[in-house]
């Protein structure tokens, strides 16, 4: 089990995440594997584009929220982190890096600032933010 000290820096309470490879993964070393997704939380603050580049360099993408059930650990995430949601001005939609459109009722979108990027916060909230603002970020790999 991951140590509570490590998890308490990321989550609002202790989260039990089994490390056994047969249940989940494979994931890059030291990443969290949960319900066939790999996650890593990065403490350094970067703008959205640099955060995206960092994730890409690890063959991952910024966090995509696609299922409240499969990603229930995200309910407990502390603070605000860049996720892979971006506003497309040409059609006014919010879409993920993979090109898929944000599904209704997955996230509560809150306009904190004028911007085209979004921060993830606990309980499936998304805060609109200027893409140039430095923030911590979450990378994710979906495993087949």
């Amino acid at each position: 089990i991951w140590s509570a000290v490590f998890l308490n820096s990321l989550f609002n309470q202790e989260v039990q995440i089994p490390l056994t490879e047969s249940y989940c993964g494979p994931c890059p070393k030291n990443w969290i594997c949960y319900k066939n997704n790999c996650y890593q939380f990065f403490d350094e603050s970067k703008n959205w584009y640099e955060s995206q580049a960092s994730c890409m360099s690890q063959n991952a993408s910024l966090l995509k929220v696609y299922s409240k059930e499969d990603q229930d650990l995200l309910k407990l995430v502390k603070s605000y982190h860049w996720m892979g949601l971006v506003h497309i001005p040409t059609n006014g939609s919010w879409q993920w890096e993979d090109g898929s459109i944000l599904s209704p009722n997955l996230l509560t979108i809150i306009e904190m600032q004028k911007g085209d990027c979004a921060l993830y916060a606990s309980s499936f909230k998304g805060y609109i933010e200027n893409c140039s603002t430095p923030n911590t970020y979450i990378c994710m790999q979906r495993t087949v």
Partner: antibody, heavy 114, light 107 residues
Framework: GGGLVKPGGSLELCCKA?????????MSWVRQSPGKGLEWIGR?????????AYASWVNGRFTLSRDIDQSTGCLQLNSLTAADTAMYYC?????????????WGQGTLVTVSS | DIQMTQSPSSVSASVGDRVTITCRAS??????LVWYQQKPGKAPELLMY???TLQSGVPSRFSGSGSGTDFTLTISSLQPEDFATYYC?????????FGQGTKVEIK
């Protein structure tokens, strides 16, 4: 620019971007041999040369670089063989559109022959 | 590396026909799938990304579907300017790989 190169020779291809913020996109290179399909060579991030990736077949023969002030990306080709004869395209990699190549240069033909 | 396999390699069709091209990935790529159109002597052009999202300016007769390993590009009513070669590409992981292409020819 492209042109005729002898086997074992070297060549540098460069591409200048305009009309968008170079620092937030990636530049990639894709080649197409005569009558053949498309082959990805590698990518470099406009904002930082720390982030690069190459196709495994490149085997260290090719090197990507970029100059953020000039909004230019370059591909250095070394130890060329006849199999490297192709049209070489510089392309903008859009990481927010499924990592698609959304803008393509006109291409430059590299011919490797003695 | 992820292999992308397109079928058919070529198709003969007439103006007004419905044309379907398939692309299969050797492993699941979710919806990280892109389609391009290339005309002779020209660079490829982006048609669609996210398996089904049309690039701005692309006519609505083009549509895409699929997720995971199997994807389809459909041209609902072929127009003279659609005779070209079509390529799929996966953006799920590096190295990014392309299908071998499908040439749509005039019958």
């Amino acid at each position: 620019g492209g042109g005729l190169v002898k086997p074992g020779g070297s060549l540098e291809l460069c591409c200048k971007a305009s009309g968008f913020d170079f620092s937030i996109y990636w530049m990639s290179w894709v080649r197409q041999s005569p009558g053949k399909g498309l082959e990805w060579i590698g990518r470099i991030y406009g904002g930082s040369s720390d982030y690069t990736a190459y196709a495994s077949w490149v085997n260290g023969r090719f090197t990507l670089s970029r100059d953020i002030d000039q909004s230019t990306g370059c591909l250095q080709l070394n130890s060329l063989t006849a199999a490297d004869t192709a049209m070489y395209y510089c392309v903008r990699l859009n990481p927010s559109f499924s990592r698609s190549f959304d803008y393509w240069g006109q291409g430059t033909l590299v011919t490797v022959s003695s | 590396d992820i292999q992308m396999t397109q079928s058919p390699s070529s198709v003969s069709a007439s103006v007004g026909d419905r044309v379907t091209i398939t692309c299969r990935a050797s492993q699941g790529i979710f919806s990280w799938l892109v389609w391009y159109q290339q005309k002779p002597g020209k660079a490829p052009e982006l048609l669609m990304y996210g398996a089904s999202t049309l690039q701005s300016g692309v006519p609505s007769r083009f549509s895409g579907s699929g997720s995971g390993t199997d994807f389809t590009l459909t041209i609902s009513s072929l127009q003279p300017e659609d005779f070209a070669t079509y390529y799929c590409q996966q953006g799920y992981s590096t190295p990014y790989t392309f299908g071998q292409g499908t040439k749509v020819e005039i019958k």
